[in-house]
């Protein structure tokens, strides 16, 4: 007789989740010599231990503590790039500008990027059918708590000038409810962070508006200023040219505004 299983509103655990996490860990530690000491089996065991046999609406940051410890990785604090709703361009940028880091360029972020996972209370099974949706089911689900935990710690580590890439094509360029708006902004440390510099990425070819004057950007400036951190903003009118100029800064066309 098939056991009754909780039906959640969100997609289930990504297929081959254990194998994917383990393979990603091995690949990452091979590419990054400073992480060669990491035991990927222990990393998987700690990851699994954070959510297996636990109710998927009752996960805490402390559940991820053993994984956070195993994944410890010192990131240059003045080379941090945050992003909101524009992940692909942020990742393309750090692939070229190799000395800068998004969260997904760290081991922990790389392991979990684009994956979904959850378990079931009192069974050692992974739920491949459905997982809780943040809005429709619960916020304290394994995926949301993981990203809240690592995002908070990533922001805490930042110093000097912190950059954030924002999507100028969205109705809310800065969204208070995004991970950046709800977690990272509030965990930048004024004792260490001098300036938050926003890069607003334009979508339209003929879009010459100054999106740094957008009301949501002004809201971000207000939040940041109240935290005694300076704020600056730049329009990136041509993201394609922007990336090209990061690759080839000597190019004559790269002296003008991008």
């Amino acid at each position: 007789v098939p056991r009754w299983r909780q039906q959640w509103s969100g997609p289930g655990t990504t297929k081959r989740f254990p194998e994917t996490v383990l393979a990603r860990c091995v690949k990452y530690t091979e590419i990054h010599p400073e992480m060669r000491h990491v035991d990927c089996q222990s990393v998987w065991d700690a990851f699994k231990g954070a959510f297996i046999s636990k109710h998927p609406c009752n996960i805490t940051e402390e559940d991820y503590q053993p994984l956070m410890k195993l994944g410890t990785q010192t990131v240059p604090c003045n080379k941090i790039l945050l992003w909101s709703r524009i992940k692909d361009l942020a990742h393309q940028f750090t692939q070229v500008q190799r000395d800068m880091f998004t969260l997904e360029d760290t081991l922990l972020g790389y392991l979990a990027d684009d994956l979904t996972w959850c378990g079931e209370f009192n069974t050692s099974k992974i739920n491949y059918q459905s997982c809780p949706d943040w809005r429709k089911d619960c916020s304290n689900n394994p995926v949301s708590v993981f990203w809240k935990t690592v995002s908070r710690r990533f922001a805490e580590a930042a110093c000097d000038v912190v950059h954030v890439m924002l999507n100028g094509s969205r109705s809310k360029i800065f969204d208070k409810n995004s991970t950046f708006g709800s977690v990272e902004v509030h965990n930048l440390q004024p004792e260490k962070v001098q300036t938050l510099e926003a890069w607003v990425i334009h979508g339209g070819r003929e879009d010459s508006r100054d999106l740094c004057q957008d009301p949501t950007i002004k809201e971000l400036e207000s939040i940041i200023s109240k935290r005694n951190i300076q704020f600056s903003c730049k329009n990136i009118y041509r993201p394609d040219k922007f990336l090209q100029c990061v690759k080839n800064p000597e190019d004559s066309s790269c002296t003008s505004e991008i």
Partner: nanobody, 116 residues
Framework: QVQLQESGGGLVQPGGSLRLSCAAS????????MGWYRQTPGKQRELVAE???????NYADSVKGRFTISRDNAENTVSLQMNSLKSGDTAVYYC??????????WGQGTQVTVSS
């Protein structure tokens, strides 16, 4: 320049108490998971007690009920209250600060000797 400076070690009789203290400078202590580790000659460093940035504590089985870890974020210090000490607690005790993305730091260590 990050520094963790342990103090409070010394010689104590079995059944006695000691309070170790770790003063941190150069880091924002409240952001770090803090721990006490110990090491005896020829053995690996082992975790004694830890306290997360959120305040949760974890103890080695051998010290549960006898040792208490606490933190004072305002003073940038972490303490380890050690009661009912045994000869097996003799070791060099190290303070540790660990942040997932901001680094791992160690103190120089303080000697604790439990002997009659």
């Amino acid at each position: 320049q990050v520094q963790l400076q342990e103090s409070g070690g010394g010689l104590v009789q079995p059944g006695g108490s000691l309070r170790l203290s770790c003063a941190a400078s150069g880091i924002i202590l409240r952001l770090y998971d803090m721990g006490w580790y110990r090491q005896t000659p020829g053995k690996q460093r082992e975790l004694v007690a830890e306290i997360t940035s959120g305040g949760s504590t974890n103890y080695a089985d051998s010290v549960k009920g006898r040792f208490t870890i606490s933190r004072d974020n305002a003073e940038n210090t972490v303490s380890l209250q050690m009661n009912s000490l045994k000869s097996g607690d003799t070791a060099v005790y190290y303070c540790n600060a660990d942040h997932t993305f901001a680094g791992v730091y160690w103190g120089q260590g303080t000697q604790v000797t439990v002997s009659s």
